[in-house]
Amino acid sequence: MVPPPENVRMNSVNFKNILQWESPAFAKGNLTFTAQYLSYRIFQDKCMNTTLTECDFSSLSKYGDHTLRVRAEFADEHSDWVNITFCPVDDTIIGPPGMQVEVLADSLHMRFLAPKIENEYETWTMKNVYNSWTYNVQYWKNGTDEKFQITPQYDFEVLRNLEPWTTYCVQVRGFLPDRNKAGEWSEPVCEQTTHDETVPS
């Protein structure tokens, strides 16, 4: 009897959908695996007789529930199938946006870039998929614990009237208000402001 794959799960970030599993202990030799997806009531092979413990399902439709399954194989024997259901648009993790930060005197000028999507044109980003897409920005004075959050209305934001010669850190994430779903924070970007722009009279 061949044991089934263990810990079968979908790892999906920005619609890069990777079905992952672990190989069970099996004394007779090395197992191979076959992973399939349900298409029009028929299961279709995606990865056949692979020695890997993952299979890329990024070409699935972003919409709807998909049934995926994987089994272990050895010689002419095979395990039972292990099934999972996956809805990309609901289940994919929203990866961190890109961010460009520029210091201008006592202001930080930020531009945000929505995450790109696997298997899509360069210009078709997560913002195109989710109509309610917005950004959350948090910033803080480097070395302090107090964080401030803002929700920019556009793909850019300016933090004005900051303390001069002070290092501020900024990070951004995608947020979907209609789903109350937040993405992953970007790595903090820390920049030092320069002088106060006001001219003494």
Partner: nanobody, 124 residues
Framework: EVQLVESGGGLVQPGGSLRLSCAAS????????IGWFRQAPGKGLEGVSC????????HYADAVKGRFTISRDNSKNTLYLQMNSLRAEDTAVYYC?????????????????WGQGTQVTVSS
Amino acid sequence: EVQLVESGGGLVQPGGSLRLSCAASGNSLDYPTIGWFRQAPGKGLEGVSCISASDASTHYADAVKGRFTISRDNSKNTLYLQMNSLRAEDTAVYYCAASLHGLGCKSEADYDYWGQGTQVTVSS
């Protein structure tokens, strides 16, 4: 059942132009995303371009960027693909497709309705 009908294909010399059209028989082309795909001889289906209804944004495959232009005329319920500076490698059957959910642009899995295709041959 929605039927998409492409037209405008033909034989053209390298460097020439063609304009493909796609109409929905008896229906409007009022879909969140509509796009063009192509299939070259012996190759798989390849995304060419799409247009999003929500913001009228247009998106292109790298291979056609700057040469092809997608547009839609809502009054005529027609989708167009203007193809300029055509090359031999653009030879393919071109398909129009429409998506009900509009979540994707390039992947054929994200489209629900398809036309029968129109042949484009670029040759001297």
